[in-house]
């Protein structure tokens, strides 16, 4: 559908005569009839297949025709058509003289014709006017014409219908060729599909209007690219919806079981060493002089066992007091009333007289200490192990059991946590924020699954006389630490005590 537009510009009839040569009286009151039809090689009379149009009287004899389109007038002349423009046409323009006011063909005498022109040719749809001028013996007509598409019709032949819209059925305007041009934010064949927020996940997000990003179940975030973990998941993440993959140091279905309390809460105070001891639990190993679950309290003096040589400690308002056994005196029962004659040195210690025999000193063999060589050497008292390593007595020597992530004789070297497979007996290694954690198979425990829990050499209470039993972890054997006055591998033999004195 379109319109053939004809713009009459100027008609010249200087002598004011009809086609017959007869003059018009008083002048030629001129109007035009236009016939538009299909292309004919030789334009012949017959039906105006594409349409006809007539003008009112436009002037007398010679005149210019004013452009009257803006005022609702009839110049250019409109010849609408409701078919595909074929691209070719034939055009007949007749100039007539109107003696009266009735311009109908049947009301005019046949010799009222002033001039008739006929053209044919091809004409493409477009906005540009084609200017033409036709001259006969007595007249000249200047005009221009074009074909444009009706509203909502587009394309080379005005055959494409396209009506802009912005509703549920589409959001577009029309291009000159009739193709749809989507409004900003819309896409698809009919511009019905909104363009979601830039970056909105293709699968997990959608939108009902432009620049929106609505998440499908199980997804969240501005771009719907974050999965929603299992409801109640505390310290875990997900890679697909409803998962709960625990962060390091957390366990359980909802990752709410604290496997690394020490790191997460740092509960131990006053320089104490923290050890994780299972879910949501920990143990603080206090430095000397401190007590309490978190080593948050100072010890009362007696709790640090200040009395030597078997002295007993009594708490007092202003500190403590040592009650010394026979043969000893001093603030800590550190002085002896015995002499070398009383053979006071145990475990092969050699006695040296001091102060002209009023006192003595024992020179102890390796592995023994104390004023009477009565104590096995605890080579760990100097706390030689670095980085929280645990010191273990091994007969005449000592060794450090290092925390995960450390190695070396004194745990002074840092290792890359799980890289060296530190978990013994098939234990599984987990890298933690400040070390590692071993998950041990049944029958094993300890920080690195190094302890056989099924064997406890001390379980049978092999030590006598209230001696302290220690399990040697490397050999699954025991070591007895004897109290004062007893010797032997099980502390089963009493030492020959010196005779009692009358004082």
């Amino acid at each position: 559908s379109g319109v053939f537009q004809l713009q009459l510009q100027e008609f010249i009839n200087e002598r004011g005569v009809l086609a017959s040569g007869r003059p018009c009286e008083p002048g030629c009151r001129t109007f035009f009839r236009v016939c538009l039809k299909h292309f004919q090689a030789v334009v012949s009379p017959g039906p105006c297949t594409f349409g006809t149009v007539s003008t009112p009287v436009l002037g007398t004899n010679s005149f210019a025709v004013r452009d009257d389109s803006s005022g609702g007038g009839r110049n250019p002349l409109q010849l609408p058509f409701n078919f595909t423009w074929p691209g070719t046409f034939s055009l007949i323009i007749e100039a007539w003289h109107a003696p009266g006011d009735d311009l109908r063909p049947e009301a005019l005498p046949p010799d009222a014709l002033i001039s008739k022109i006929a053209i044919q040719g091809s004409l493409a749809v477009g906005q540009n006017w084609l200017l033409d001028e036709q001259t006969s013996t007595l007249t000249r007509l200047r005009y221009s014409y074009r074909v444009i598409c009706s509203d909502n019709y587009y394309g080379d032949n005005c055959s494409r219908l396209c009506k802009k819209r912005n509703d549920h059925f589409g959001h577009y305007v029309c291009q000159p060729d009739g193709n749809l041009s989507c409004l900003p934010g819309w896409t698809g064949e009919y511009c019905q599909q909104p363009i979601c927020l830039s970056g909105c996940h293709e699968q997990n997000g959608y939108c009902s209007k432009p620049a929106e990003c609505l998440c499908r179940p199980g997804w969240q975030g501005r771009l719907c690219n974050e999965c929603i973990p299992h409801n109640g998941c505390r310290h875990g993440t997900c890679s697909t919806p409803w998962q709960c993959t625990c962060d390091e140091g957390w366990g359980g279905l909802f990752c709410d079981q604290d496997l690394n309390y020490c790191t997460h809460h740092s509960p131990c105070k006053n320089g104490a060493t923290c050890s994780n001891s299972g879910q949501r639990s920990y143990t603080c190993t206090c430095r000397p002089g401190y007590t309490g679950v978190d080593c948050e309290l100072e010890l009362s003096e007696c709790d640090s066992n200040p009395c030597r040589n078997g002295g007993s400690c009594k708490d007092q308002e202003d500190g403590y007091h040592c009650l010394c056994p026979p043969g000893y005196y001093g603030l800590h029962c550190e002085h002896s009333t015995l002499s070398c004659a009383d053979s006071p040195c145990f475990n092969g210690g050699s006695c040296r007289e001091r102060n002209q025999g009023a006192n003595y000193a024992c020179e102890c063999p390796p592995n023994f200490t104390g004023s009477n060589c009565e104590k096995k050497v605890d080579r760990c008292t100097s706390n030689p192990c670095a980085n929280g390593g645990q010191c273990l007595n091994r007969g005449p020597s000592r060794m450090c059991r290092c925390r995960p992530g450390f190695t070396g004789t004194y745990c002074e070297l840092h290792v890359s946590d799980c890289a060296r497979n530190p978990c013994a007996h098939g234990g599984t290694c987990h890298d933690l924020e400040n070390g590692l954690m071993c998950t041990c198979p049944a029958g094993f425990s300890g920080r690195r699954c190094e302890v056989r829990t099924s064997i406890d050499a001390c379980a049978s209470s092999p030590c006598f006389n209230r001696a302290t039993c220690y399990t040697d972890l490397s050999t699954d054997t025991f070591v007895c630490n004897c109290p004062y006055g007893f010797v032997g591998s099980r502390c089963e033999f009493p030492v020959g005590l010196p005779p009692s004195f009358p004082w």
């Epitope: 309390y261 809460h265 509960p267 949501r280 639990s281 920990y282 007590t291 309490g292 679950v293 978190d294 948050e296 309290l297 100072e298 010890l299 009362s300 709790d303 202003d318 500190g319």
Partner: antibody, heavy 119, light 108 residues
């Protein structure tokens, strides 16, 4: 506002076990910093610290009472309990549960429950 | 154990006056871990001061604490009628935690 409420029998026979429970409301017993504490006050006398428990189960007792004490926690019920065995008339007192946070200053107390040891 | 001695056992003052309560420790209280409590008849103690001198939120500023080592003081700058009660000091630096025997503040 955190509240503590002691409960348990007001009369215990000598040599038997005193059992008290403290219910914590408007606060989680699982608070990392909290020391859930028992304190007693003998009639007309001063205050005596008995001991505490943390939600992890760690306990610390007054050495003078340690041999007779057992403090426990039930996180599912938001409660902690005191058991003292072999009681004598000297254990007759008002027993308070209290909360300490971070250090042992008691910012929240129960209203106290009086326990009389008598046959 | 650290023994705390409060003196005197009873103090008589009039409203509007300044009251000074003393607490002496048998050994030095490290980090000034000393607290003061107020107890009224039939009620539980109420924490007033911690760290020897830090006032608990909501406690009127007429209450102040001072001291270090073994000698500590609670001062009530201008006594109000509701201040007449029992006052206890408490040390929490050493186990076992201990309280003073209390000072009774009564109206003269």
């Amino acid at each position: 506002q955190v509240q503590l409420q002691e409960s348990g029998p007001g009369l215990v026979k000598p040599s038997q076990t005193l059992s008290l429970t403290c219910t914590v409301s408007d606060d989680s017993i699982n608070n990392v910093e909290s020391y859930w504490t028992w304190i007693r006050q003998h009639p007309g006398k001063g205050l005596e610290w008995i001991g505490y428990i943390k939600y992890t189960g760690g306990i610390h007792y007054n050495p003078s009472l340690k041999s007779r004490l057992a403090i426990s926690v039930d996180t599912s019920k938001n409660q902690f309990s005191l058991k003292m065995n072999s009681v004598t008339a000297a254990d007759t007192a008002k027993y308070y549960c209290a909360r300490a946070r971070g250090s042992h200053t008691f910012d929240v107390w129960g209203q106290g429950t009086t326990v009389t040891v008598s046959s | 154990a650290i023994r705390l001695t409060q003196s005197p056992g009873t103090l008589s003052w009039s409203p509007g006056e300044r009251a000074t309560l003393s607490c002496r420790a048998s050994q030095s209280v490290s980090s000034n871990y000393l607290a003061w409590y107020q107890q009224k008849p039939g009620q539980a103690p109420r924490l007033l001061i911690y760290g020897a001198s830090s006032r608990v939120a909501g406690i009127p500023d007429r209450f102040s604490g001072s001291g270090s080592g073994t000698d500590f003081t609670l001062t009530i700058s201008r006594l109000e009628p509701e201040d007449f009660a029992l006052y206890y000091c408490q040390q929490y630096s050493r186990s076992p935690i201990t309280f003073g025997q209390g000072t009774k503040l009564e109206i003269k």
